[in-house]
Interface confidence: low
């Protein structure tokens, strides 16, 4: 349905709140140096705008697509050179190059300072003070740091942001009230961060191919109950959702999506028995908990796979009419079967049933071919079960940190070029796979495990994209999606690796370690231990320990110490010299 | 830039045995799982064998399964296929791959035929 003005229709779809929100988002997504009074200024002029096109469709420049609006809006900003070098070359190219161009240059990693939170009470006054303000600022400070934040999404956080501080400034201990639930919002914010992320690698690297095959497997195993054609529609849709989302196009991303949880709660009947409570929640709500809602109760009659795309003689007749229809009807079938199985897993079996039909339906007698082909399952389904369990009885008995640690080493071994800081990021991120999966009963443990994995792993590939450094990284990267972790799983101690010159300075600890949090200071040892495996590739795991025992020992002792800096610079001498001569460096 | 030559095709008598090789460089070898895939003339592709980085863990299609086994040589960049029992069906160009069962060829792969 075409409208006379794009940027009035969205005003008014989404209402002036919800339509500079999104605005913002977008700039800060694009723009992520700017400085947050910059986009403000730019966000009222735009909004303004959109306003005299709600008045009157017909105004100047209401016709214009969104992308040549808010473009040449960002090309006002006057110190784009200087701030973002090449990046301005964009503003020389007509849209849609212009757009892709902007996409392009957004940053995973940008050169930002980490957010420090303030005092509890400075900030309950800031709220109060202007909560406005506060508000935007936070939507501000996240899009810029997370480029390709699910922007909708985005919007229910800061809800919850609102309602946190809202709630608590006014409790007797606003410390005690506000804290837990920020570290929650941070934690979840990441994780959704990094969810989305996959999804745009997924459509922007592998094609809207790649992401619908993924779409139809998770939404078969979490509405079993609906029809292929019913998952096929939701599938297309949610597709539009997110290519808009990871493409700028904001806007439009945050009415499809409303549009598409209005479609669900009006047809819930035919969808799955689970959404009654999602859909009594307000918009924002209502989404993300569709979003996240628990798997559907799988009907208890379904026949078995075989008869249809095995033992059936007209396997190849289905296939060769329309074979996306027929790989997306199988992998629908098998995914609402098994909601035991990682999505990646589905999709993998699904590509071997693919590459099966293409080579059989070939063949002299096809269906002597592909008679086997579930059997060509059983390793595929028993990699990933192993692998599983194997890490869950490491993690048991390790726990998180030392389980941590062990990743750190496994990874840093594999592909040591890669940077200090993205390979403690990853591997802490890995390691969390315990403490997340884990406790969850077999059934559950692999779509846990495995497609958590893919999120973090989707980390490390879009960090080295940025700074390739790996060939081994980017052929796990690039080659193929749902092969991934088991391309990374299967590297072993890179040879290669001409070790890293010993470095005394990268060992040296001063007293401010003892004043931070454990976390940080988790990170401290944990970059250490890094650097030793660069150093040493072939320590052994006996040997890093003994080294890192020691580190933990020295640092707790001149944490205790009276003269803490004369402790880390006399004793620090001597555990660099120690362990210099464990490690035979 | 990685390359893969097979090597150790040739005529052979059905019941008879080949050793196939399959030097690889360019890349970590040591680091990948590896097949073996064959194309019979006419047909697709098929997979044959696979085995894990370590050389730990083997998989075969059911039609080779007892015949046919994989092995790797780490050291040497090398991945073997030892045929015994060879059928007419087994005459095809095989090759070898980098990854798992749904590994696609580079190579120029090396004819084996089975006739008598």
């Known amino acids: 349905d075409a409208h006379k003005s794009e940027v009035a229709h969205r005003f008014k779809d989404l209402g002036e709140e919800n339509f500079k929100a999104l605005v913002l988002i977008a700039f800060a997504q694009y723009l992520q140096q700017c400085p947050f009074e910059d986009h403000v200024k730019l966000v009222n002029e735009v909004t303004e705008f959109a306003k005299t096109c709600v008045a009157d469709e017909s105004a100047e420049n209401c016709d214009k697509s969104l992308h040549t609006l808010f473009g040449d809006k960002l090309c006002t900003v006057a110190t784009l050179r200087e701030t973002y070098g090449e990046m301005a070359d964009c503003c020389a190219k007509q849209e849609p190059e212009r757009n892709e161009c902007f996409l392009q240059h957004k940053d995973d990693n940008p050169n930002l300072p980490r957010l420090v939170r303030p005092e509890v009470d400075v900030m309950c006054t800031a709220f109060h003070d202007n909560e406005e303000t506060f508000l935007k600022k936070y939507l501000y400070e996240i899009a810029r740091r997370h480029p390709y934040f699910y922007a909708p999404e985005l919007l229910f956080f800061a809800k919850r942001y609102k309602a946190a501080f809202t709630e608590c400034c006014q409790a007797a201990d606003k410390a005690a009230c506000l804290l837990p639930k920020l570290d929650e919002l941070r934690d979840e914010g990441k994780a959704s961060s990094a969810k989305q992320r996959l999804k745009c690698a997924s459509l922007q690297k592998f094609g809207e191919r790649a992401f619908k095959a993924w779409a139809v497997a998770r939404l078969s195993q979490r509405f079993p109950k609906a029809e292929f054609a019913e998952v096929s529609k939701l599938v297309t849709d949610l597709t539009k959702v997110h290519t808009e989302c990871c493409h700028g196009d904001l806007l439009e991303c945050a009415d499809d999506r409303a549009d598409l949880a209005k479609y669900i709660c009006e047809n819930q009947d035919s969808i799955s028995s689970k959404l009654k409570e999602c859909c009594e929640k307000p918009l924002l709500e209502k989404s993300h908990c569709i979003a996240e809602v628990e798997n559907d109760e799988m009907p208890a009659d379904l026949p078995s796979l075989a008869a249809d795309f095995v033992e059936s003689k007209d396997v190849c007749k289905n296939y060769a009419e329309a074979k996306d229809v027929f790989l997306g009807m199988f992998l629908y079938e098998y995914a609402r079967r098994h909601p035991d199985y990682s999505v990646v897993l589905l999709l993998r079996l699904a590509k071997t049933y693919e590459t099966t039909l293409e080579k059989c339906c070939a063949a002299a007698d096809p269906h002597e071919c592909y008679a086997k082909v579930f059997d060509e399952f059983k390793p595929l389904v028993e990699e990933p079960q192993n692998l599983i369990k194997q890490n869950c009885e490491l993690f048991e008995q390790l726990g998180e940190y030392k389980f941590q640690n062990a990743l750190l080493v496994r990874y840093t071994k594999k592909v040591p070029q890669v940077s200090t800081p993205t390979l403690v990021e990853v591997s802490r991120n890995l390691g969390k796979v315990g403490s997340k999966c884990c406790k969850h009963p077999e059934a559950k443990r692999m779509p846990c495990a495995e497609d958590y994995l893919s999120v973090v792993l989707n980390q490390l590939c879009v960090l080295h994209e940025k700074t390739p450094v790996s060939d081994r990284v980017t052929k796990c990267c690039t080659e193929s999606l749902v092969n991934r972790r088991p391309c990374f799983s299967a590297l072993e101690v890179d040879e290669t690796y001409v070790p890293k010159e010993f470095n005394a300075e990268t060992f040296t600890f001063h007293a401010d370690i003892c004043t931070l949090s454990e976390k940080e200071r988790q990170i401290k040892k944990q970059t250490a231990l890094v650097e030793l495996v660069k150093h040493k590739p072939k320590a052994t795991k006996e040997q890093l320990k003994a080294v890192m025992d020691d580190f933990a020992a020295f640092v707790e002792k001149c944490c205790k110490a009276d003269d803490k800096e004369t402790c880390f610079a006399e004793e620090g001498k001597k555990l660099v010299a120690a362990s210099q001569a464990a490690l035979g460096l | 830039q990685v390359q893969l030559v097979e090597s150790g095709g040739g005529v052979v008598q059905p019941g008879g045995s080949l050793r196939l090789s399959c030097a690889a460089s360019?890349?970590?070898?040591?680091?990948?799982?590896m097949s073996w895939v064959r194309q019979a003339p006419g047909k697709g592709l098929e997979w044959v064998s696979s085995?894990?980085?370590?050389?730990?863990?083997?998989y075969y299609a059911d039609s080779v399964k007892g015949r046919f086994t994989i092995s790797r040589d780490n050291s040497k960049n090398t991945l073997y296929l030892q045929m015994n029992s060879l059928r007419a069906e087994d005459t095809a160009v095989y090759y070898c791959a980098i990854g798992g069962p749904g590994a696609s060829p580079s190579g120029q792969g090396t004819q084996v035929t089975v006739s008598s």
């Open positions: 360019g890349f970590a070898f040591r680091g990948f799982g």
């Open positions: 085995i894990n980085n370590g050389g730990s863990d083997t």
